[in-house]
């Protein structure tokens, strides 16, 4: 891990940019914990495997989460 620190958060900056669900490889939601006192959302993009920290408070990101969970519920039997 590049940063040695007592608080083990992942995100250095957060993005409010809308993300096309089709360009997503993976979406991780890391709940607040004793290691990092804030929710972190990390999107792994299909393009070059770029990982991007998303702003959990952003309207665009909340819409993305809804779209992804809707897509998942469609897929599950």
């Amino acid at each position: 891990v590049p940063l040695s620190r007592t608080v083990r958060c992942t995100c250095i900056s957060i993005s409010n940019q809308p993300v096309n669900p089709r360009s997503l490889e993976k979406l991780e939601i890391i709940p607040a914990s004793q290691f990092c006192p804030r929710v972190e959302i990390i999107a792994t993009m299909k393009k070059k495997g770029e990982k991007r920290c998303l702003n959990p408070e952003s309207k665009a990101i909340k819409n993305l989460l809804k779209a992804v969970s809707k897509e998942r519920s469609k897929r599950s039997p």
Epitope: P2, I12, N16, C36, R38, I42, K48, G49, E50, K51
Partner: antibody, heavy 124, light 109 residues
Framework: QVQLVESGGGVVQPGRSLRLSCTAS????????MHWVRQAPGKGLEWVAV????????GYADSVKGRFTISRDNSKNTLYLQMNSLRAEDTAVYYC?????????????????WGQGTTVTVSS | EIVLTQSPGTLSLSPGERATLSCRAS???????LAWYQQKPGQAPRLLIY???SRATGIPDRFSGSGSGTDFTLTISRLEPEDFAVYYC??????????FGPGTKVDIK
Amino acid sequence: QVQLVESGGGVVQPGRSLRLSCTASGFTFSDYGMHWVRQAPGKGLEWVAVIGYGGLIKGYADSVKGRFTISRDNSKNTLYLQMNSLRAEDTAVYYCAREGAGSSIYYYYGMDVWGQGTTVTVSS
Amino acid sequence: EIVLTQSPGTLSLSPGERATLSCRASQSVSSSYLAWYQQKPGQAPRLLIYGASSRATGIPDRFSGSGSGTDFTLTISRLEPEDFAVYYCQQYGSSPIFTFGPGTKVDIK
């Protein structure tokens, strides 16, 4: 427009302290990690310190660890560098720079916005 | 601690020529952590490339980055007069956390 403006530089004697400020405008400061980078006269770039968007992540170059402290006040859109026990080798132009949107410990988007710098001279 | 070496120290070329700048790391660096910057005299640096090969916003497509492991390259396909400057590579992820190379100066032949 997106802008970073440094202030607080000047001439200071070895062993003394100085606090640099960097005021941000034109973007949501509280969403971005911030850095201090310095450049000694006629030399290359040297990274000094980083602070995460919420102030939880901090990191320092070995050359300043224990002497310099990076901090931020998101309500004032301002980044700080408290420099103690200054040495002649700390003489440089000090730039503040913004970490790219979405950067994490897994993927680095570079320092995408820079201020014009403030000059610190440590001399007796 | 990862050390970055840039070569050549100075590159003397004419406008219209191709410039190839090298950045070598003392240990393997993830391409996710490699960036390139341009700096002109009296100015702040400007981000050109991140993730070893992705162009930053507003950077012309004559600038391209490539490489992996320990060897990375910045290529300027056709030098424009405004491209004569110092170029720095930078890596993120070791202690010290962010490291710049010593720079390559591209000057007019």
